[in-house]
Every structure is written in structure tokens, then in C-alpha cells.
Amino acid sequence: MAVTACQGLGFVVSLIGIAGIIAATCMDQWSTQDLYNNPVTAVFNYQGLWRSCVRESSGFTECRGYFTLLGLPAMLQAVRALMIVGIVLGAIGLLVSIFALKCIRIGSMEDSAKANMTLTSGIMFIVSGLCAIAGVSVFANMLVTNFWMSTANMYTGMGGMVQTVQTRYTFGAALFVGWVAGGLTLIGGVMMCIACRGLAPEETNYKAVSYHASGHSVAYKPGGFKASTGFGSNTKNKKIYDGGARTEDEVQSYPSKHDYV
């Protein structure tokens, strides 16, 4: 029961986590900047992985997508890749874990198969969570680096002068959503791996083999290392290794001239 609960909870936590990773990837507010030195109007600028938006105090809002791949920073491309890999792995993990759930019966699937599927999905969730955390952390690092570099970026061009506007770089809501979602997916994956240990059969059931000698019936059980004579109080061989499977030891055994080893 505890295994089923752990597996089920791991699945739900991972599901919430992956939904969060998808939400974070689609969100526009990965970084936000307040332009406080704007001479015309207060401008609130925010960027996502896919587009950049500007919102003015008048209420005017405009978003533009990054339609080019060549002009984008390599780090932004890397973050996109990490988030997509996280989503794909998480989605596959969810699909696998649905079939691995102990509460769902699919044909005559054995517990060992379910255990393997649970472990597979667990590992996928862990990697998915790590990808999301890594992606968000890389972007956060990029923002911090840009903030410290912004004072040193000034150059004179043919048409005059270009300089960086001093802005306050702040972490957008998407970063926090991504960190939490990645963490949840990671925790869900760990729970699935723990559940896998409970699902897997701990020991193999061996069938006891009876060896009958002429005149004396001796039952040799490799699992229990206990011999008993065919006569007297133990004519019915007691089960020594009880793994749940019926063996020939459960059938009454009588001595016979025609018993062979």
C-alpha cells in the first residue's frame, strides 16, 4: 500500500512539475527591466525565451517574437534547448509512468516489468527536473553577468554613439516558476525510484526438489537445508521455504520400491 502511495504521489508531483516547466518555458517574463531614465514615459520591458515585450504607462503593450536564430545569443539558445529537452523527457516519463502505476492493470503485466517502468520514468523525471533547473540557472546567470557588464559597454559608431542604458535587471516570474517546477519534477522522480524498490520482487521463489531413496524417503530442500525421513511423524513434508508458490512438497509422499533419484 505504501509503495502504491509513493508511486502515485511521485506521479502527481512530477505531473505538476512538468506542467510548471511547460508554463515557465512559454512565459514572457524571464527577465524584467524598468527604464527609469526614459524622458517620455515609464517603460516596463520584459523578455521571454521566444519574444520580447514592452509595456508603457499609457497601457500600450507590444510583443515581438525572435524570428531569427542567427542573431540570438548562444546562451539563450542553450536555455531553450535545455527547457525543451526537459519537457520532452518529462512527457515521455509521464507516459511511461502511467503504464507503470500499480493501481492500473494492463493485461498480465508482471510486477518486475512495472518496477522497471517505474525506475525508467523516475530517472526521466530526475533528468527532466535537472534540465529545467539548469536552464533557468543559466538564464539567471546571464542576467547577472549582463548587469555587471552594462557599465562597460559603450562604443562610438559611424552614426554617432551607442551606449547601454542603465537599467535594473530583475529576475522574472518565469525563473521562479522554473526553479520550483524543476524541483518538483526532481522530487517526483526520486519518489518514483523509491517506489521501484518496493515494486521489485526482493527474492526469487525456488521450487523445492524432492529426492527419494529406496526404503527411506529423504526430502532434500536446497532452500532450507533440512532432511526428514519418510516414516514417523513427518511423513508429510513440511514446507520450509514458503515463497507463495505451490510445490510438490505440498503433496503427501510415500516410500516406494520404484522411487528413483
Partner: nanobody, 121 residues
Framework: EVQVVESGGGLVQPGGSLRLSCAAS????????MVWYRQAPGKQRELVAG???????NYAHSVKGRFTISRDNAKNTMYLQMNSLKSEDTATYYC???????????????WGQGTLVTVSA
């Protein structure tokens, strides 16, 4: 390389009109605020007029009612229509554009080299 180029300056008589243009070019993702500044000989640079991407405008008190600022977002171009020009409007007019650069994920402030406007009889 991002750059802005001003044009339309020249010599004009008092009471006359002039239209200045500022065109931004280069690897620009989005131009947000565009502003006209001016600097008269021996004086500090001052704001003349500015316009946001959404169309919000701001004018210096000295030019209100005489100058009109406008822009074409699609062409990344800003215009300054100057009417009823006075001798005190004589200055070098600079274009300033605040552009969001996707390549560095930061705001850039781009300045032009200026265009001279002389109001004289």
C-alpha cells in the same frame, strides 16, 4: 551595428518651417523611445521632444504648440515638424533612440551625429 542618422537641417528664416527626420538602421530588434535633443553653441544639451513606441509624446515648454513629433514604427523613423521658427531655435539637433537589442539582451541608447538648424534673417 546599430546607428541613427538625422537629416533635414539647414538655414531657414524666422517664422519659417523645417522638417527633421531620424532613421534608425542596423541590427535592431525593436526601437522603443525616440527623442530629439538640441545643443546651442555654448549651452547644455536639452530635450526638445520625444515619442514612445505607443505614441506618447513629451515636449519642452519652449517648443510646445510650434513643434510636432511623429514616428513610423515600421520604418524605425521619427520626424520633427518645426513651425514658427525663432532665432533661439538655432542649434545642432540630435536624435536619440532607445533600442532593445536581442543579441545582448539589454537596452542600447543610440545617438546620432546631429544636424544643424540655423534660424537667421
Amino acid at each position: 551595428e546599430v546607428q541613427v542618422v538625422e537629416s533635414g537641417g539647414g538655414l531657414v528664416q524666422p517664422g519659417g518651417s523645417l522638417r527633421l527626420s531620424c532613421a534608425a538602421s542596423g541590427n535592431i530588434f525593436r526601437i522603443d523611445t525616440m527623442v530629439w535633443y538640441r545643443q546651442a553653441p555654448g549651452k547644455q544639451r536639452e530635450l526638445v521632444a520625444g515619442i514612445s513606441r505607443g505614441g506618447t509624446t513629451n515636449y519642452a515648454h519652449s517648443v510646445k504648440g510650434r513643434f510636432t513629433i511623429s514616428r513610423d514604427n515600421a520604418k524605425n523613423t521619427m520626424y520633427l515638424q518645426m513651425n514658427s521658427l525663432k532665432s533661439e531655435d538655432t542649434a545642432t539637433y540630435y536624435c536619440n533612440a532607445q533600442a532593445w537589442d536581442v543579441g545582448t539582451i539589454r537596452y542600447l541608447e543610440v545617438w546620432g551625429q546631429g544636424t544643424l538648424v540655423t534660424v537667421s534673417a
